[in-house]
Interface confidence: low
């Protein structure tokens, strides 16, 4: 007889996803003896940092570090004490900090210095706080999705690795300040900045990726608000009966609204703006976000950015999921085709404030913005990225896979901790038939 072995020891890793609107902490775990297996790393727990994203602390950098303390204290409880010292801890900041770094590099540096100071106070193996490039954000999101769905390699029942026949899944991420599209392509990249070559488990992947700064949901809403102030005395995407006071300083402080910014304005002035429930004018307003007039390549998505034709199936996560899920569940509208998605957007944009509140009891936050959000998602996918009905049929809207949030964080950690080998593991792996 053999001794019954104890369950293998677990390893842990922590990633702080410092997004534009908020920061999330993800704790991952995996069996120590199966580090090179695909789909082995999973989410252990998570924590949402209260308040805004770290970029909102530009005027109070130390507050950015302080804001993380609650989640870090949770990490001390969630990761076994004997594993603290060996647990890598990373902070990656995305488009909110990219924007801050463009407009105020000194503030950006101060914020990163402050969070670094806080993170080094904890007993984890802190490995740095940095701003991810848009390309990294896109590619690591793609790696996360395909790793979790086991699209890279699979472990056969006879203990042999094989490459599954299914291809990889494209990834679309809609954050607060930027949006990313990433997919495997056979088309040559005409723009060197959009191609990434990856070698994972001995397989070669040529991936197209692009990140559109200022095309995240929150910044799009700000830009539409700025456009509405510029061209209308009302907001066509807001529901009729909804009215609010808009602080001009808030609207125009973002670098994303620079094109609509008046030469002179009183930043402390408040302007009253009402909704008009006008789907057609709202569509026109959203259309203004995309430029198709210039393409220096054989083909483009929008704004003169090279993009090969979308190919294969896609997973659309983060705000793509939240927007479509709202249409599907809260509004009870079908969104299986592009035509249905457009009809659903029009439907939401036709609702008055009273009708919307009746349809969605509990006064959901950002309820007035779902019309603009739905119009944007529909136009981004169809006109922007060029999905036709057939291609759209291959898009799934999902925020989790294998009980783990889909986003760049897991892919980032897998990369930095070398949990995805470049070369294939040995033919036999772990299965003892003796």
């Amino acid at each position: 007889t053999r001794d019954i072995r104890e369950p293998p020891a677990l390893k842990y890793g922590i990633v702080l996803d410092a997004g534009s609107s908020h920061t999330s902490m993800f704790i991952y775990k995996w069996p120590a003896d199966k580090e090179n297996d695909t789909g082995i790393v999973g989410q252990h727990s998570s924590c949402d940092v209260p308040g805004g994203g770290i970029s909102s602390y530009a005027d109070n950098p130390s507050g950015a570090g302080q804001s993380l303390v609650g989640c870090l204290e949770q990490a001390l409880r969630d990761v076994p004490k004997e594993r603290h010292a060996g647990t890598p801890l990373y902070l990656g900041a995305t488009a909110g900090m990219r924007l801050l770094n463009l407009t105020n590099p000194e503030a950006s540096t101060s914020v990163l210095t402050a969070v670094t100071h806080t993170l080094t106070q904890y007993p984890f193996d802190f490995r740095g706080a940095r701003i991810l490039s848009g390309q990294e954000e896109g590619v690591f999101g793609w790696v996360t999705a395909n790793y979790l769905l086991e699209n890279f390699i699979k472990y056969g029942w006879v203990g042999r690795w094989f490459r599954p026949r299914k291809g990889t899944l494209g990834a679309m991420d809609l954050g607060g300040a930027s949006t990313q599209i990433t997919f495997e392509t056979t088309s040559p990249a005409e723009d060197r900045a959009s191609e990434v070559q990856l070698r994972l488990y001995g397989q070669h992947y040529r991936v197209y990726t692009h990140s559109f700064l200022c095309y995240g949901r929150d910044q799009v809403l700000q830009r539409l608000l700025a456009s509405a102030l510029q061209t209308h005395s009302f907001h066509p995407c807001w529901p009729r009966g909804f009215s609010t006071h808009v602080l001009l300083g808030d609207v125009y402080q973002s670098p994303c609204t620079v094109a609509q910014r008046p030469q002179t304005f009183n930043s402390s002035a408040r302007v009253s703006l009402s909704g008009s429930s006008d789907p057609h004018l709202c569509r026109d307003l959203v259309s203004g976000l995309f430029s198709f007039s210039s393409c220096p390549f054989s083909r483009c998505s929008f704004n003169g950015v090279f993009q090969p034709p979308v190919a294969g199936n896609f997973i659309a996560f983060s705000a793509f999921f939240y927007t479509v899920n709202f249409l599907r569940t809260s509004m009870g509208l079908p969104v299986a085709t592009l035509q249905q998605l457009e009809a659903a957007a029009v439907n939401v944009c036709n609702q008055t404030w009273a009708q919307l509140q009746a349809r969605v009891p509990g006064q959901q936050a950002h309820l007035a913005d779902y019309c603009a959000g739905a119009m944007f998602v529909q136009q981004l996918l169809s006109r922007g990225y060029g999905f036709d009905e057939r291609a759209f049929g291959g898009v799934i809207f999902q925020k989790k896979a294998a009980d783990t949030a889909v986003g760049w964080a897991l892919g980032y950690m897998l990369n930095l901790t070398n949990l995805i080998p470049a070369d294939p593991p040995g033919l036999r792996k772990g299965t003892d038939f003796s």
Partner: antibody, heavy 125, light 106 residues
């Protein structure tokens, strides 16, 4: 430093062809598109076309389709432009120019950041 | 194609003078670039994307404008600024250049 060095002046007869070269140095040749621009005496600059050296993909101004053929030799970091069926109106200085770009709030902006010294092509019988 | 019209065709200025060159587009463009060409030389990038100064270009050069009307300003002309200045649009295919403004120094 980044440099584009073009071949010397050419005098050619009407109906003939000419192939001019542009050798790049000081940067990774395949990282940037190479464009060609025409400057006829007393005329404005005219964009002829470009090539992506990494994938040999070329694009032409409609006005120069059939007139110009742009190619590259990656191993020599050199771009070429062949002009065919030459006529007197093809007499001009031809420039190669590297296409630079920068990304600004999600939009790619393009411009010619480095130019060759120019090659004078004279079409004369 | 978009036609860019530059004015004046020729401009004569004294050292230290402030001058403005204009570039008018036949239809709206997102941005333009300015190039400087001295006799017997290739054009050189001066200003990209309407108002950004290219590397090594002195701060006396500045650009502005939007839509169909753009300007290049030299705040204090120097003798070495004698050249032909071209505007160039990359908003609409095919990419086109203006006819140029020749700046002469008195």
């Amino acid at each position: 430093q980044v440099q584009l060095v073009q071949s010397g002046a050419e005098v050619v007869k009407p109906g003939a062809s000419v192939k001019i070269s542009c050798k790049a140095s000081g940067y990774t040749f395949t990282d940037y598109n190479m464009d060609w621009v025409k400057q006829a005496p007393g005329q404005r600059l005219e964009w002829i076309g470009d090539i992506n050296p990494k994938y040999d993909i070329s694009t032409y101004n409609q006005q120069f389709k059939g007139k110009a053929t742009i190619t590259v030799d990656k191993s020599a970091s050199t771009a070429y432009m062949e002009l065919s069926s030459l006529r007197s109106e093809d007499t001009a200085v031809y420039y190669c120019a590297r296409r630079g770009f920068f990304l600004y709030y999600g939009i790619n902006y393009y411009y010619f950041d480095v130019w060759g010294q120019g090659t004078l092509v004279t079409v004369s019988s | 194609e978009i036609v860019l019209t530059q004015s004046p065709a020729t401009l004569s200025a004294s050292p230290g003078e402030r001058i403005t060159l204009s570039c008018s587009a036949s239809s709206s463009v997102s941005y333009i670039h300015w190039y400087q060409q001295k006799p017997g030389q290739a054009p050189r990038l001066l200003i990209y994307s309407t108002s950004n100064l290219a590397s090594g270009i002195p701060a006396r050069f500045s650009g502005s404008g939007s839509g169909t009307f753009y300007t290049l300003t030299i705040s204090s002309v120097e003798p070495e600024d004698a050249a032909v200045y071209y505007c160039h649009q990359w908003s609409s295919y095919p990419w086109t250049f203006g006819g140029g403004t020749k700046l002469e120094i008195k």
